[in-house]
Amino acid sequence: RPSFSLVEDTTLEPEEPPTKYQISQPEVYVAAPGESLEVRCLLKDAAVISWTKDGVHLGPNNRTVLIGEYLQIKGATPRDSGLYACTASRTVDSETWYFMVNVTDAISSGDDEDDTDGAEDFVSENSNNKRAPYWTNTEKMEKRLHAVPAANTVKFRCPAGGNPMPTMRWLKNGKEFKQEHRIGGYKVRNQHWSLIMESVVPSDKGNYTCVVENEYGSINHTYHLDVVERSPHRPILQAGLPANASTVVGGDVEFVCKVYSDAQPHIQWIKHVEKNGSKYGPDGLPYLKVLKHSGINSSNAEVLALFNVTEADAGEYICKVSNYIGQANQSAWLTVLPKQQAPGREKEITASPDYLE
């Protein structure tokens, strides 16, 4: 029912942190901000390769290098995160491979999730050697600015020592940081001198200061957190799908449409039809019949199966996918051959009995 226009509008601001509605799960490449990333296009016999990010053509620039089947991103930033695709164009067909890039301080402050080296941060002092607090691992504190995509986990660390063992407390924007200040609260692991916030949201942006003190002194260190929201995009359809098909009269066939979308998408299968011998209505609008439509979470929304086809079923079939940001559509042709003539290069596909059409 949604409009069939080839013009997409993508200027709209995001609403909530998007859920992924990916029918096919692409590989995920993770890099920390500032790192370089190299990805090889995993397609065979690639004569010409083109690259896209979030459905938009990707060309070389001062940070993006495209050499043959390799994509290099230098000095990655969270804004490089997204859905990438390389398409290999061949003489007879094309193939697309999708992958995700996630540039993130998923566990910030240069640390891994398990804190396996945490023990070395917990320094035991001789009880007679009184000492004001001091930092034990400044390398883990060098990076003060942390830009993290929404919904990720952030960890700030202030490994310290002192005698007696110092205590640690955290401030947000210079004020005491309380559990009720954020949905889901936060965790403090004193033995690892860390503050952990899960599933960060834009309201978590700000300055976080660890204050480490004992009776002989006090030290502090401030981190700045920026939560980067990845803008949802209009749906992206896998190149080459749906694929052209042919079958004999009475045969069965299916078309498949693979979708990548941040916001919840809706799939429609559409065909140009004639009514009363005309392709256009009295209102001048073409007769585009919606054969099937449903949300992506419905079973087999991405598959259109046609059973016992007739010559009237021949023609163009359009897979149209829309979300609140925009839409995308791709089409394929069905050729219906006389009973005695076998299908050509595009072999008949037998449909599973699960499908409705």
């Epitope: 029912r1 949604p2 409009s3 429609q268 559409i270 609008l285 007769y287 919606v290 949300g295 409705l356």
Partner: antibody, heavy 120, light 107 residues
Amino acid sequence: EVQLQQSGPELVKPGASVKISCKASGYTFSDSYMNWVKQSHGKSLEWIGDINCNHGGTSYNQKFRDKATLTVDKSSSTVYMELRSLSSEDSAVYYCVRWDGFLYHSMDSWGQGTSVTVSS
Amino acid sequence: DIVMTQSHKLMSTSLGDRVSITCKASHNVDTAVAWYQQKPGQSPSLLIYWASTRHTGVPDRFTGSGSGTDFTLTINNVQSEDLADYFCHQYNTYPLTFGGGTKLEIK
């Protein structure tokens, strides 16, 4: 002439279920979709979902996915909507509305409505 | 979900006047907007679809316009039988949504 004849008013108890019907005539039933729309307080309209009258495929508004179930009986050109676990918030007039299935067209013909009152 | 906002809940007009009822979509809905009229005690009936196409049998004093996010239903030479509630409806993106309605009354 397109006609959609809905079943009569229903008075049901909280927690119960109700099944209302919509019988279509005057057009090729199997070429269309039947939508259901809720109207509360005589004002706001909410789309519940639709059903393909040929193969029975359904699409629901997420808000009503656990509330409504749409079914079709092609032999009698009748569409049904079952509402379950009813509460006072479900008290409303429910309309069946035809859509001819053409992309540029909107829903065009409405039934007379079925009033559902949920009360103990 | 796309929100359709009809900012005027009530509009007063005089017979023979021209009145414009507006509707704003929270996101681009192209021209996939319909307008429905609902008279007291009756079911809604279709006036306009595809933003500006009059449904069969609708008088030509009803005109629809707009695209993208801003839409208008204009009634020229208002008649007494036009006093009703008017709803805009977007069918560009699922779930389908409706505006809150505008009641047209005589001054």
